[in-house]
Interface confidence: medium
């Protein structure tokens, strides 16, 4: 005799009882009415299951909650099914068996026929697991049912001192969808919140779960697929304060079926959004956008932000959204990089783009900007990177495209190409009034507009000039004079330790900032406008340093241990971290601080010049870093502002030395023998280079490196020209993310050394 192998299969669901109504007492598990009604309903459910062929497999069941409307009973039951039958008893099959029994004319005296008028249409059966029941049971001491009326904003109170885990069972009118809003109110917490697209905490119906206070998403809104949601709040540590505010609404379904006709121009023409953007998209999302283009000369570009598309095998589900574009199936995924999907136009009837959520797990709403591009020349003067659809500078010595094709087959790399014979000459020799090319082509068209390219400067009127680095050099090169605007910058005031450094004199580096918490120097920074200081994003990565309120910014400072008349201090009103900043890779290591009041410029306080995207900092050039950082690896911060000259290093050698962990947003500088370098406490401080005009331009921000001043490992800096578009966007009020390697990598911030 061999015992039959069985598996416990858990089902969760709900049914509606048409001849009963919900009362407030039934919403409280501790009430006598609840206990009595749930016992009767559980018996009814048991009888219903037992009267079908499932009866022989019945193990146990529970009715754990009641809901509004005709009385809705929420339940689970367990069947012990023979192993070989496990796959045949899907939730759909089980529902069918139960519905058939409810509709049958059998003359049973069971309560589901005599006492309860069960609505067969309203029966819901979902797959669950033993673990789901464990989670559910752990919350039953703090189980809260709430019906969310239209127009009502219902606040949800957190677990009290006695309970560590609570479950809200949320229900709204059937034709509406539940939307939960979560807003973090504290910097540090260990709480977990999970939201489910079901009445109970079913793992397979998880929409999203969050752990700890997320600075990336200080406010998040999450949509269910319909009128039911479960929210589990698990407390992480003893606290008298809720670390976030939770509230819930019932909202109407929003349509996302759109027909658009684009105009024959190349700038951004609009955006497509998932319903209730920036809310998380709903598990039931299905959007269909039809875009018509004016002619086949154009292709359609979809510009994504921190989200990208890639091909996926047909048998694999898309976990972060499925896209169907011209019969191509693509899966979305979140990424800390920009991305564009380019759709070549082959038919004049345009293109249909479908976006669908394939699973209950969702993510932040998706917003896509759309524009047209010229199919015959998609990236004028630049290189089209097929990996990410972006136009990137070509042949500038920096591999912007992940496959490096932008730096392949270059006649001249990071140099000017003579028209006569394709000879390469160094960029500073272009438009310097001395012919270097055979027929002097390097000195032609220096006073007129030229096609835009990697090293051409783009004027405000969008025309381009050939002269490299024409900004603020005292000569008007743009027709509209825009190269000489915003030039109150980069001049030393009273010009007369960093590792290997020397002491600076007062006013020598008037843009230098000291970023402090409670009187302690943490990071450097640079003044770039009358209310803005730039620094490194990694200075704020620890939870205890994330709030702008904590920081004081000192300008015009010389010594850390004393104040002098030339220095001024500011509080920080807003902090912007680059949205693509990644702690592990150090990529996009830049942040902007908005000061609480404008700076009055003086001999000791004035901004550094910001470079244009096309500004060329030549490898081999000597530039300077300044800061109060440690003067030796592991040493204390310096009292007096230190300065040191470093040499800019070509990207290819830099990348080789750091085993290809150097991104295009990074720049290297230093010395082969080490000795001169930035160190802890210098983080975010400026790497500045002097142009022939005498003005100083910001080339980099102290970011990371292997040790300090170590031989054969130079300092790595954030390459300002690669993040300048984001900087300008934030400075002009266009947003950004406003909100509150190798084994010895360190961040050059005194608080962070790993």
């Amino acid at each position: 005799y061999k015992a039959e192998v069985t598996v416990s299969q858990v089902y969760s669901g709900s049914l509606r009882v048409l001849n009963r109504h919900f009362s407030q007492d039934l919403g409280r598990r501790e009430s006598i009415a609840f206990r009595s009604e749930s016992a009767k309903a559980q018996k009814m459910l048991q009888e219903l299951v037992a009267s079908t062929r499932l009866g022989t497999y019945y193990n146990s069941s529970s009715v754990y909650s009641f809901g509004e409307g005709p009385l809705t009973c929420f339940f689970w039951f367990i069947l012990d099914i023979p192993e070989y039958q496990r796959l045949t008893l899907s939730p759909e099959v089980v529902r069918e068996l139960l519905v058939d029994e409810l509709l049958s004319n059998s003359s049973t005296l069971a309560s589901y026929k005599t006492e309860y008028e069960v609505d067969p249409e309203g029966l819901v059966i979902l797959e669950a697991s033993v673990n789901d029941i464990v989670v559910l049971n752990s919350t039953l001491g703090c189980y809260r049912y709430s019906y969310v009326n239209p127009g009502q904003v219902l606040p949800l109170k957190g677990p009290d001192q006695q309970t560590t885990s609570c479950l809200w069972h949320l229900q709204g009118p059937e034709d509406l969808m539940i939307k939960v809003r979560l807003e973090w109110t504290r910097v540090d917490c260990r709480d977990r919140v999970a939201m489910y697209d079901a009445a109970g905490p079913l793992e397979k119906r998880l929409i999203t779960s969050v752990y700890g206070c997320s600075r990336q998403e200080p406010v998040m809104e999450v949509l269910a697929s319909g009128s039911v949601m479960a929210v589990v709040w698990k407390k992480g540590m003893h606290s008298y304060y809720d670390p976030f505010l939770l509230s819930v609404k019932s909202v109407a379904f929003q349509d996302c079926q759109v027909n658009l006709t684009l105009e024959g121009r190349l700038d951004t023409q609009g955006f497509l959004r998932t319903p209730y953007y920036p809310s998380y998209y709903s598990p039931s999302t299905h959007c269909s956008w039809h875009l018509t283009v004016p002619s086949l000369d154009y292709g359609l570009a979809l510009w994504f932000d921190a989200y990208a598309l890639r091909r996926q095998k047909y048998n694999r589900l898309c976990t972060q959204g499925q896209w169907m574009i011209q019969n191509r199936r693509l899966c979305g995924f979140r990424t800390l990089q920009p991305y564009a999907e380019r759709i070549p136009m082959v038919a004049s009837d345009g293109v249909t783009i479908n976006f669908t959520s394939q699973i209950s797990l969702t993510g932040p709403g998706v917003q896509v900007y759309y524009s047209l591009y010229n199919q015959s020349d998609p990236c004028p003067g630049e290189f089209l990177c097929s990996v990410n659809g972006l136009c990137v500078p070509a042949c500038d010595g920096i591999k912007d495209c992940p496959n490096g094709l932008d730096e392949r087959n270059c006649v001249c790399r990071a140099m000017f190409q003579c028209q006569e014979d394709s000879t390469c000459i160094s960029l500073p020799r272009v438009c310097d009034r001395q012919p270097d090319c055979l027929n002097g082509s390097d000195e032609e068209q220096c006073q007129e507009g030229v096609p835009c390219g990697t090293f051409t400067f783009q004027c405000e009127d969008r025309s381009c000039v050939k002269k490299p680095n024409p900004e603020c050099d005292g000569q008007s090169d743009c027709r509209d004079g825009s190269d000489e605007q915003h030039c109150d910058c980069g001049l030393q005031g009273l010009s007369s330790r960093i590792v290997g450094g020397t002491v600076s004199s007062e006013g020598e580096w008037p843009w230098q900032a000291s970023l402090q918490i409670r009187g302690r120097h943490i990071c450097g920074g640079a003044l770039i406008a009358d209310r803005w200081v730039i620094t490194a994003a990694h200075c704020f990565q620890e939870d205890s340093m994330a709030s702008p309120k904590l920081w004081t910014v000192f300008l015009g400072k010389m010594r850390q241990n004393s104040r002098w008349p030339g220095e001024v201090s500011f509080k920080v009103s807003r902090l912007f971290l680059h949205p693509y900043h990644e702690e592990d890779s150090h990529d996009y290591d830049v942040a902007l601080l908005q000061l609480d009041h404008p700076v009055v410029y003086s001999a000791t306080v004035r901004p550094v010049c910001l470079p244009a995207r096309s500004h060329f900092f030549e490898p081999g050039q000597h530039c300077w870093i300044t800061g109060w950082g440690a003067q030796r690896e592991g040493g204390p911060v310096s009292n007096t502002l230190q300065k040191v000259d470093v040499q800019l290093v070509p990207q290819d050698l830099c990348s080789e030395a750091y085993r290809y962990q150097v991104s295009p947003r990074m720049l290297c500088a230093g010395y082969r023998k080490g000795k001169k370098d930035a160190c802890q406490g210098d983080s975010g401080g400026p790497l500045v280079c002097r142009e022939p005009s005498g003005r100083w331009f910001l080339a980099g921000l102290v970011s990371w490196g292997l040790g300090c001043g170590r031989p054969n490992f130079f300092g790595v800096y954030t390459r300002v020209t690669r993040v300048i578009n984001w900087i300008q966007q934030v400075l002009t009020g266009g947003g950004g993310s406003g909100g509150g390697g190798s084994h010895h990598h360190h961040h050059h911030g005194s608080h962070h050394h790993h």
């Epitope: 392949r408 087959n409 140099m415 081999g620 040499q647 082969r672 023998k673 031989p711």
Partner: antibody, heavy 124, light 111 residues
Framework: EVQLVESGGGLVQPGRSLRLSCAAS????????MYWVRQGPGKGLEWVSG????????GYADAVKGRFTISRDNAKNVLYLQMNSLRPEDTALYYC?????????????????WGQGTTVTVSS | QSALTQPPSASGSPGQSVTISCTGT?????????VSWYQQHPDKAPKVMIY???KRPSGVPDRFSGSKSGNTASLTVSGLQAEDEADYYC??????????FGGGTKLTVLG
């Protein structure tokens, strides 16, 4: 006066070993990357090996990899080339050369000071 | 790594210009701007004339100039003089801590 003087060359049978030395004077030896370059009879220059100032970065030409070892003694201002498993095609005048501008972080991979060379003949 | 390709010989009369080419690949000359040129007189050690494609060390006459286009670098000697007669070698960094030389070009000053 900046000077590099090679020594240690001579006649050697195939398969045997030889060690070349290069004595440096007139400059701060440990500021510079150093190289060995050879020139076969009636032939062109061929780069052999290079070593960083503190010996932590080393490169070899494919033709000598696994047989030759470059090293330096900064205390004595001497560069070495240990040549094992010598072949007739290793016969050449071996030059020791210094990398330009040794204080900069990165190499220009350019040799601005050369010795007069030492002759190595591999023959049975 | 294979040697860079140079023409075996080049010639010109005094006062004329002569250009010597040096062709590599997209992994050496084409990728790095670390091209150097050396002059070697018979029985003498080489002397650097150009480094980083077009930079001249101090003491080298400005008659010598270097350039690069794609995978090919060039050395131009203008106003040719008798003492310029020598062998000329190009070299390039080739990545992975390796340097590669050209086969050499014998420059003859005619007359």
């Amino acid at each position: 006066e900046v000077q590099l003087v090679e020594s240690g060359g001579g006649l050697v049978q195939p398969g045997r070993s030889l060690r070349l030395s290069c004595a440096a004077s007139g400059f701060t030896f440990d500021d510079h990357v150093m190289y060995w370059v050879r020139q076969g009879p009636g032939k062109g220059l061929e780069w052999v090996s290079g070593i960083s100032w503190n010996s932590d970065t080393i490169g070899y030409a494919d033709a000598v990899k696994g047989r030759f070892t470059i090293s330096r003694d900064n205390a004595k201002n001497v560069l070495y080339l240990q040549m094992n498993s010598l072949r007739p095609e290793d016969t050449a005048l071996y030059y020791c050369a210094r990398e330009k501008d040794g204080d900069f972080y990165y190499n220009y991979f350019v040799m601005d000071v050369w010795g007069q060379g030492t002759t190595v003949t591999v023959s049975s | 790594q294979s040697a860079l390709t140079q023409p075996p010989s080049a010639s010109g009369s005094p006062g004329q210009s002569v250009t010597i080419s040096c062709t590599g690949t997209s992994s050496d000359v084409g990728f790095y701007n670390f091209v150097s040129w050396y002059q070697q007189h018979p029985d003498k050690a080489p002397k650097v004339m150009i480094y980083e494609v077009s930079k001249r060390p101090s003491g080298v006459p400005d008659r010598f100039s270097g350039s690069k286009s794609g995978n090919t670098a060039s050395l131009t000697v203008s106003g040719l003089q008798a003492e310029d007669e020598a062998d000329y070698y190009c070299s390039s960094y080739a990545g992975s801590n390796k340097v590669v030389f050209g086969g050499g070009t014998k420059l003859t000053v005619l007359g």
